[in-house]
Interface confidence: low
């Protein structure tokens, strides 16, 4: 004899009952008419049940809410089923014997139907798991009901002192989707809220979770994929109030389905959104965009931020978004990198792009901007890197693309080809009134504008110009004249300069920033305008330095311990960090500090000059950092503001060194024999070059590095002219931000 | 640098209270909870409770609820654990040590060695 | 309230010879696990945090590691001061829970 084997096997669901009506007090667990009516409820679920073949494997059942409209109630049940039966009994099965006993006119009235009138049609089932109980179970001390009605802001009570964990259980009108904003209100916490499509806390239908104070998301939004919510909280450590806030709304179905068509250009035309962006995009997300392109000359490209796609087996479930583009299906996927997907045209009744969440698990709203591309030149004067479907400088020394084959096949890499023979010359030499290949090619076309490459100047008109590095020189290059804009930059003040000393003085380095919190210097920073500086994003990443308020940024400073009249100090109104910023490899790493009121310029207090995308800094050029970091590795900070020269390294040298961990959006400075170098306490601070021009331009942010000093190993830094953009982004758009 | 000075010892008797005091220095002490934890002769450790300087808030173990009344003197920088209805299974060594929900206790004070004796 | 298993509760080891201590909590306790050694008639003195993490001034020959319900401190060649009691805890949840300590003595 051999005991047959069982599986408990768990239903949630809810069923709605004709016959009663929802009051306020059914929606307090602890009222006595919950606790009645709740009990009979389960008595009736247990006798539906019992009433189906279903009956002889029924083990337990709870009704632990009602909700609005006929009485509706939640519920689960668990049915022991022997292990052959298993899959057989899906919950679409369960719901279908349950229907049908609701539906047939058995002789024998079940007592349940003299009481309770059950709506067949409006029967949930779905599938659950005992984890699912216990998480639901260890919330009844705090469980809330709420009913949304269409149109209005529904704010939530926050947790209850006592308890460690809480349910909001949320329902609308059901041709409504339930929308949930959550807050954050502290920088730092330990506190988990998970958000489900369904009524309660089922697994299997996450849509999102989050653990801590999320700093990349301050504020989300949710959508559910129809009228029902669960959103759980459970308690961290030491939350003596509420760490977050909670509100909802009952939002109509938005459509995406676009039919839009392009014209014959190219710069972005438009976006694609997801509904609700930036709300997370809803479980039940299908969206289907047709783009018609006006010839076949034109691709079209995807522009997507911080989201990729690839092709995954069709067997594999995406987990971030489904796409259908041209009968490929890809997988989208949240990556700290740029990404643009491009598809080339061949036909000309356009193309349809369909996104779908295949699961219940979501994530932040999807926003595509959309161009079109020249088939035959997708990047002109520069290399299309078909990993990432971005354009990137060619044979500049740096690798951008994740293959290399940006810098693969160069005839003069970092050096400008002359035309005659092919010969390489060095970029400073180009334009600058002296022939150095034999036909004086590097000469030629110096007045006038030239087609866009790595190395050439962008001007505001859009038109380019051969002669490297021409901002700021005091020659207009361009003819719009906007390589001599925005110049008041980059001069020393006072400088009577140490030659070869290691102490500054005063005025030396007059974009040089202390920033502080309580007192203590933790970071460099440098001054770029009249009310920003810029640092490493690397300094903020504690939870507990991530408020801007923390900070106090010194300008004109040179001793740590003491003021002089030179200095000036400011709080910090807002902190940017870059979005792409991760703490583990370092990419990145850069942030803008928004100061609360501008800046006076000064001999000692000045800003160093941005370099345009384009500017060439060279490998082997003499390079300073300055700041008030460590004079040996493990030491204290400095108290003077110290200064060291250090060659720029190729790329390639420093990448080997530390074994390919250097990314395009990094630069290396310092010596093989080691010694000079920054330390703790210099991160953010500037790495400046000098231009023969006189003026200094920020080359790199103190970063990371293995040590200090170490021989072999030299000082990474941000490499600034591939964060520009993002820069002068912050700084347009929150120019008049106070 | 970071110190927690605790009494060497506490003698009571039965049924009376005893109050012991842990003064921190080298940190910002409204910033960081004191944790305080119990360990009888020859035996491991038990948590009594938490208590938050900036703000006075406590958790306790369920255990010690009764037993244990935890307050700060912000201006003294004083942390202090008040035990009351001492019995014989009070005799331990009681710590206070800086709290963070990150390193957890990374300095302990010497602790307080309390005897309950008729 | 989650429990700590530690284990062994008691071992004896040779100098220069490797040492693994086990704790093991009865629920995901998410890395927030600690590991203490203790002397007798002294405070406990922490050595490892967020379960993998080196206390400053720890040497390096100790080591912790683990995810999950499993967590283990390792000395990799055991010297005269690592003799004492090693105790683990758990800050993931309120109470904080401490293991029931290992006794680490020469053999």
């Known amino acids: 004899y051999k005991a047959e084997v069982t599986v408990s096997q768990v239903y949630s669901g809810s069923l709605r009952v004709l016959n009663r009506h929802f009051s306020q007090d059914l929606g307090r667990r602890e009222s006595i008419a919950f606790r009645s009516e709740s009990a009979k409820a389960q008595k009736m679920l247990q006798e539906l049940v019992a009433s189906t073949r279903l009956g002889t494997y029924y083990n337990s059942s709870s009704v632990y809410s009602f909700g609005e409209g006929p009485l509706t109630c939640f519920f689960w049940f668990i049915l022991d089923i022997p292990e052959y039966q298993r899959l057989t009994l899906s919950p679409e099965v369960v719901r279908e014997l349950l229907v049908d006993e609701l539906l047939s006119n058995s002789s024998t009235l079940a007592s349940y139907k003299t009481e309770y009138e059950v709506d067949p049609e409006g029967l949930v089932i779905l599938e659950a798991s005992v984890n699912d109980i216990v998480v639901l179970n260890s919330t009844l001390g705090c469980y809330r009901y709420s009913y949304v009605n269409p149109g209005q802001v529904l704010p939530l009570k926050g947790p209850d002192q006592q308890t460690t964990s809480c349910l909001w259980h949320l329902q609308g009108p059901e041709d409504l989707m339930i929308k949930v904003r959550l807050e954050w209100t502290r920088v730092d916490c330990r506190d988990r809220v998970a958000m489900y499509d369904a009524a309660g806390p089922l697994e299997k239908r996450l849509i999102t979770s989050v653990y801590g104070c999320s700093r990349q998301e301050p504020v989300m939004e949710v959508l559910a994929s129809g009228s029902v919510m669960a959103v759980v909280w459970k308690k961290g450590m030491h939350s003596y109030y509420d760490p977050f806030l909670l509100s909802v709304k009952s939002v109509a179905f938005q459509d995406c389905q676009v039919n839009l068509t392009l014209e014959g250009r190219l710069d972005t035309q438009g976006f694609l959104r997801t509904p609700y962006y930036p709300s997370y995009y809803s479980p039940s997300t299908h969206c289907s965009w047709h783009l018609t392109v006006p010839s076949l000359d034109y691709g079209l490209a995807l522009w997507f931020d911080a989201y990729a796609l690839r092709r995954q087996k069709y067997n594999r479930l995406c987990t971030q978004g489904q796409w259908m583009i041209q009968n490929r299906r890809l997988c989208g996927f949240r990556t700290l990198q740029p990404y643009a997907e491009r598809i080339p045209m061949v036909a000309s009744d356009g193309v349809t792009i369909n996104f779908t969440s295949q699961i219940s698990l979501t994530g932040p709203g999807v926003q595509v901007y959309y161009s079109l591309y020249n088939q035959s030149d997708p990047c002109p004067g520069e290399f299309l890197c078909s990993v990432n479907g971005l354009c990137v400088p060619a044979c500049d020394g740096i690798k951008d693309c994740p293959n290399g084959l940006d810098e693969r096949n160069c005839v003069c890499r970092a050096m400008f080809q002359c035309q005659e023979d092919s010969t390489c010359i060095s970029l400073p030499r180009v334009c600058d009134r002296q022939p150095d290949c034999l036909n004086g090619s590097d000469e030629e076309q110096c007045q006038e504008g030239v087609p866009c490459g790595t190395f050439t100047f962008q001007c505001e008109d859009r038109s380019c110009v051969k002669k490297p590095n021409p901002e700021c020189d005091g020659q207009s290059d361009c003819r719009d004249g906007s390589d001599e804009q925005h110049c008041d930059c980059g001069l020393q003040g006072l400088s009577s300069r140490i030659v070869g000393g290691t102490v500054s003085s005063e005025g030396e380095w007059p974009w040089q920033a202390s920033l502080q919190i309580r007192g203590r210097h933790i970071c460099g920073g440098a001054l770029i305008a009249d009310r920003w500086v810029i640092t490493a994003a690397h300094c903020f990443q504690e939870d507990s330095m991530a408020s801007p308020k923390l900070w106090t940024v010194f300008l004109g400073k040179m001793r740590q311990n003491s003021r002089w009249p030179g200095e000036v100090s400011f709080k910090v109104s807002r902190l940017f960090l870059h979005p792409y910023h991760e703490e583990d490899s370092h990419d990145y790493d850069v942030a803008l500090l928004q100061l609360d009121h501008p800046v006076v310029y000064s001999a000692t207090v000045r800003p160093v000059c941005l370099p345009a995308r384009s500017h060439f800094f060279e490998p082997g050029q003499h390079c300073w950092i300055t700041g008030w970091g460590a004079q040996r590795e493990g030491g204290p900070v400095s108290n003077t503001l110290q200064k060291v020269d250090v060659q720029l390294v190729p790329q390639d040298l420093c990448s080997e060194a530390y074994r390919y961990q250097v990314s395009p959006r990094m630069l290396c400075a310092g010596y093989r024999k080691g010694k000079k170098d920054a330390c703790q306490g210099d991160s953010g601070g500037p790495l400046v070059c000098r231009e023969p021009s006189g003026r200094w331009f920020l080359a790199g942010l103190v970063s990371w590095g293995l040590g200090c000093g170490r021989p072999n190993f030299f000082g990474v830094y941000t490499r600034v002219t591939r964060v520009i953009n993002w820069i002068q982004q912050v700084l347009t758009h929150h120019h008049h931000h106070h | 640098q970071v110190q927690l000075q605790q009494p060497g010892a506490e003698l009571a008797k039965p049924g009376a209270s005893v109050k012991m005091s842990c003064k921190a220095s080298g940190y910002t002490f409204t910033s960081y909870w004191i944790t305080w934890v119990k360990q009888r002769p020859g035996q491991d450790l038990e948590w009594i409770g938490n208590?938050?300087?900036?703000?006075?808030?406590?958790y306790y173990n369920e255990k010690f609820k009764s037993k244990a009344t935890l307050t700060v003197d912000t201006s003294s920088r004083t942390a202090y654990m008040q035990l009351s209805s001492l019995t014989s299974a009070d005799s331990a060594v009681y710590y206070c040590a800086p709290y963070d929900s990150d390193y957890a206790m990374d300095y302990w004070g010497q602790g307080t060695s309390v005897t309950v004796s008729s | 309230d989650i429990k700590m298993t530690q284990s062994p509760s008691s071992m004896y080891a040779s100098l220069g010879e490797r040492v693994t201590i086990t704790c093991k909590a009865s629920q995901d306790i998410n890395n927030y696990l600690s590991w203490f050694q203790q002397k007798p008639g002294k405070s406990p003195k922490t050595l490892i945090y967020r379960a993998n993490r080196l206390v400053d001034g720890v040497p390096s020959r100790v080591s912790g590691s683990g995810s999950g319900q499993d967590y283990s401190l390792t000395i990799s060649s055991l010297e005269y001061e690592d003799v004492g009691i090693y105790f683990c805890l758990q800050y993931d949840e309120f109470p904080l829970t401490f293991g029931a300590g290992t006794k680490l003595e020469l053999k």
């Open positions: 208590i938050y300087p900036g703000s006075g808030s406590t």
